[in-house]
Structures are given as C-alpha cells and as structure tokens.
Amino acid sequence: MMTGTIETTGNISAEKGGSIILQCHLSSTTAQVTQVNWEQQDQLLAICNADLGWHISPSFKDRVAPGPGLGLTLQSLTVNDTGEYFCIYHTYPDGTYTGRIFLEVLESSVAEHGARFQIP
C-alpha cells in the first residue's frame, strides 16, 4: 500500500533570465527512493539515481543544474520555460509517486523572483 505523499513548491513564478529551484519532498513512507526523474511536460530533463548519481539530458545541460538534494535548478529562464514540471519518485517497495509544479516565467518588471501563487 502506498502511504507516501509528495510535497512540492507548488505554483511558482520567476523572472526571465533568472533561475529557479524546483523541489519535491517525499514524506509519510519508509520506502527507499531509488531514482527521481524530472520532466517538463513531455521532455525528460534530468534523472538522479541512488547508484549512478545525476544524468542531465544533453539538450538541457547548459541551463539545468542538479540539486540542491534531489531538486533541480533551472537557469537563464525564458518565457518558453513556463509550464508544468513533474518530479517522479521511483521507490521500493511502494512504486512511483509523482509531484507537479507549475512555473510561470515573467518579464522582469512583472515578477517577484520566486513568488508563490496561491494553490487552488
């Protein structure tokens, strides 16, 4: 039975040209985290594996940095980075847990860096 829950940074905004940290946290389970996959809509961004460490997709290497922890740092943000991001926790023996973050990248005059949106 899967008892865990994923906590995320929820809906966030950031300035164009800036950077943002995407964070998820798995709680309420003793399951072992074997791997975390980070996806942007239908693109695999990065993987953190307990044995192999980090793999960043080559097409994102210039703008994606691993960490902190199991999180992911997006740099040199553009308006095209606006959208849904998913953290997919592969665990044993529970299985897979998925968290969702919505990032909005705004022109620098509009956004407060890292400001939180109210989650509906």
Partner: antibody
Framework: EVQLLESGGGLVQPGGSLRLSCAAS????????MHWVRQAPGKGLEWVAN????????GYADSVKGRFTISRDNSKNTLYLQMNSLRAEDTAVYYC???????????WGQGTLVTVSS | DIQMTQSPSSLSASVGDRVTITCRAS??????LNWYQQKPGKAPKLLIY???SLQSGVPSRFSGSGSGTDFTLTISSLQPEDFATYYC?????????FGGGTKVEIK
Amino acid sequence: EVQLLESGGGLVQPGGSLRLSCAASGFTFSSYSMHWVRQAPGKGLEWVANINSNGGNTGYADSVKGRFTISRDNSKNTLYLQMNSLRAEDTAVYYCARVPYDVWMDYWGQGTLVTVSS
Amino acid sequence: DIQMTQSPSSLSASVGDRVTITCRASQSISSYLNWYQQKPGKAPKLLIYAASSLQSGVPSRFSGSGSGTDFTLTISSLQPEDFATYYCQQSYSTPLTFGGGTKVEIK
C-alpha cells in the same frame, strides 16, 4: 571497456530447462539495472525480463511469467536467466543488456542461441 | 501494454539520401523512446536515447525528435555502413516494447 558475455544457450527439448549467464566486466555491475531481450530467428526484438541493481525488484514479459526467473550475483558480476518449461516459441537469441537509469540499453552482449526442439 | 508502431517496415535508399523513420506509441510515453541499429548476426547498438539524445560515439548524422506519441529517427546523409535494421523502444513502462523494425536497404 564495458563487456557483457552471455553463455548457457543450446538445444533443449520442449518442457526442458536452461540457465543462461551474462558475465559483466569493465563497469560497476552492482550499480546498474540489467535486462534480458530475445530475438526469434528472422524476427524483431522482444523484452523478456529486468532486475534492478540490488536484485530486489524484477519484472517479466507475460509470455515468460511463471516460467523464467531473472537473478544476479553482484559479487560475481553475473546476471542469470533460469528458463523452465521451455516451449518451441522460446527459440531465440537471448541478449543481456545494461540499462542505466532504467531508460536506455547502452551496452548489449553478443547473444546466446537457445533452440527448443524435439 | 504500450504498442509501438514503426513505419515504414522497409525502405530502399541511396548513399547520401536523407532517411526518416517514424515510430508511434499507443499512448503518451513522454520522451522515453530509444532508437537502436542492428546489423545481421550482431547485437543491437544504441543510437538515440530519451527521444533526442545522441549516444556517445554515434555519428551526428543520426538525430531523433518527438515526444508524447510520435517520434522520428533521421539519418541526414545515408552512409554505406548505415544499411541495417532500426528499432524504436519505449521505456515508459513495463513491459518494455519495441517497434517491429525498419530495414534500410540499398537502392
């Protein structure tokens, strides 16, 4: 240099058993998921089974579930496939493959031929 | 199970031609799509992983694109050593499944 070397194939009668081995070298075997994939003569590729890095988690194709068992011995850098109740349709070349991050098969062995026939 | 449909099943082309092979998944697989090349009597060789990432040591004339359900492998300028069979494979969920293969033959 990464190397995977399968062995244990051969001719076996229907209902018989075989144990395939895949000896790994050139990398930290205990850090990688490993898979078996087969290819019947003149046909395409078919996934057979997988096992995670510590051997605690396995998966099987429906066509072999209950008959085949995948296992590994990390102290010997070796992957195994125990095949029981073999059928004619199991005739194929069997490949072992290394699968980093459980996503892609980056290294394959040369394959070992299993022929099930009376 | 996720079905992978590859097309065409075979094609004839000349050295220097641009070749495109497509693969369609029966449901969305994000970018968990890999491409392999296989020559007769040999093991498959990884070309492209995660839809668009070029495996180390693979010539840059090979490229992959797509996400969701539709994917493409392109060989920008076919070379003599590229005549082989190509397979797509999804790793989104088990059972892992392969396309039926595309045989690239000399015209």
